[in-house]
């Protein structure tokens, strides 16, 4: 906390400008009016205040807005956002996607901080659902964002938003999350033709049930081994050798290299040896 001292003669700030970066912390405290700061927040980010100077500016805004900052101030916080605690952010009501983007930009290139997580949570809750534009924005900044949500939170994602999801956004999702996302993806892509549908649905297949895998096996999709290895074991086990052969197409030879790993190992053990021998891969059931 900066102690209260009188502003030296001639140093009272009339506007937020570059000269303020030469003010010591106590001078900023004494000479910059909080209301002036709030009305000229758009200038703050254009001035390279140091981290310590930002402490003083935050303190001023906190005194002016004890119940939380208005969005007109939040959207111009810039680097001041780095000074906010999750407790500060919980007082905010952020409704504009542009405000969200501006604050995420400040944190760009860094891991998702508790502040960012709180900001996103406040924003999404305020909107009531994770709409396509929001999801587009969040996954652009944090490709792993979707997989950081609980299955319960994912249930609020409308199927239309699934179009914004890229394969890399699902890299860290676990089966429980894919169980929620797969039906939404199936619904979102239902009007696409066979090959296009498979390209879109492929990264969600870790949540697909047996009957959908059987249906895919009839469509010459040539699923790669990496996708096959991510399928639910309980969904793969009931598939016949013929269905797996059709599902994988030319990639079926890759089963040999994966015969000790799930779900291939468990699937092999469920098959008749005669059927496995038809593959000519030397798989032992």
């Amino acid at each position: 906390e900066v102690e209260k001292t009188a502003c030296p003669s001639g140093k009272k700030a009339r506007e937020i400008d570059e000269s303020l970066i030469f003010y010591k912390k106590w001078e900023l405290e004494a000479c910059v009016d909080a209301a002036l700061l709030a009305t000229q927040m758009d200038r703050v980010n254009a001035i390279p205040f140091t981290y310590e100077q930002l402490d003083v500016l935050k303190h001023k805004l906190d005194e002016l807005y004890p119940q939380g900052y208005p969005e007109s101030v939040i959207q111009h916080l810039g680097y001041l956002f780095l000074k906010m605690s999750p407790e500060d952010i919980r007082k905010w009501n952020v409704t504009s996607l542009e405000t969200l983007k501006a604050l995420l930009e400040v944190n760009k290139g860094h891991e998702m901080s508790p502040q960012v997580a709180t900001l996103i949570d406040r924003f999404v809750k305020g909107r009531g659902q994770l709409d396509k534009d929001t999801l587009d924005t969040l996954t652009a900044f944090y490709p792993g964002y979707l997989c950081s949500l609980s299955p319960e939170e994912l249930s609020s994602v409308p199927p239309s938003s699934i179009w914004a999801v890229r394969p890399q956004d699902l890299d860290t999702c676990d089966p429980r999350q894919l169980d929620v996302l797969y039906p939404k993806a199936r619904l979102a892509f239902q009007n696409m033709n066979g090959s296009e549908y498979f390209v879109k649905i492929q990264s969600f297949l870790g949540g697909a049930p047996t009957e959908d895998l059987k249906a895919l096996s009839q469509q010459n999709v040539s699923m790669d081994l990496a996708t096959f290895m991510k399928l639910r074991t309980d969904a793969v086990l009931p598939l016949t050798v013929a269905e797996v052969q059709k599902l994988l197409g030319p990639h079926v030879e890759g089963l040999k290299a994966e015969e000790r790993h799930r779900p291939v190992r468990d699937w092999i053990l469920r098959q008749r040896q005669d059927d496995l021998d038809t593959l000519g891969l030397g798989l032992q059931g």
């Epitope: 570059e18 970066i21 030469f22 003010y23 010591k24 912390k25 254009a46 390279p48 205040f49 140091t50 981290y51 310590e52 100077q53 930002l54 680097y79 780095l82």
Partner: antibody, heavy 120, light 107 residues
Framework: QVQLVQSGAEVKKPGASVKVSCKAS????????MHWVRQAPGQGLEWMGM????????IYYEKFQGRVTMTVDKSISTAYMELSRLRSDDTAVYYC?????????????WGQGTLVTVSS | DIVMTQSPDSLAVSLGERATINCKAS??????VAWYQQKPGQSPKLLIY???TRHSGVPDRFTGSGSGTDFTLTISSLQAEDVAVYFC?????????FGAGTKLEIK
Amino acid sequence: QVQLVQSGAEVKKPGASVKVSCKASGYTFTSYWMHWVRQAPGQGLEWMGMIHPNSDNTIYYEKFQGRVTMTVDKSISTAYMELSRLRSDDTAVYYCAIIITPVVPKFDYWGQGTLVTVSS
Amino acid sequence: DIVMTQSPDSLAVSLGERATINCKASHDVGTSVAWYQQKPGQSPKLLIYWASTRHSGVPDRFTGSGSGTDFTLTISSLQAEDVAVYFCQQYSSYPLTFGAGTKLEIK
């Protein structure tokens, strides 16, 4: 990778001016403040000021105010520092440097330096 | 302006031994201190920031510590390539200011 390449050494007479250039590559030139720091022979480092290539905003250290002019040419990603009314104690190596995070003004990348000698 | 006073001016240490360089700020600067290494004929290179955070690629024999007004750079086991001048810098407030430097040599 980030590179800051400065112009060659200069010898100037007292009262003259010198203009040092700094060509940037390997990053978006308009994204970061460009700073200038000088080092007199066998001495410490002295910050002179900075310019933001996107806005042309300049901030000069009081000591150099009125004698220093910092400019940029965005089209060739080059920053310039001109020092006028040179004195013998302006003899120094002049460095351009960039700071990636403005709130943490540590110097992340430096030019190789330009020796300016002021002598009659 | 905040004055950064470095000590000693020069230091001779045997290979493999510990080298300690101090820096004192005229005002409280929190942990807003960086350390640089400058080898002869070269520009300075960032070693440490936030008083104790090593910059990427800096060997772990370099350690920074301190807060407020007193700061220390320690090289735990001196190597031949560590011969250089070391500078501290405060970035708590503008103007940014540096120490006068400490010349480190091998004994």
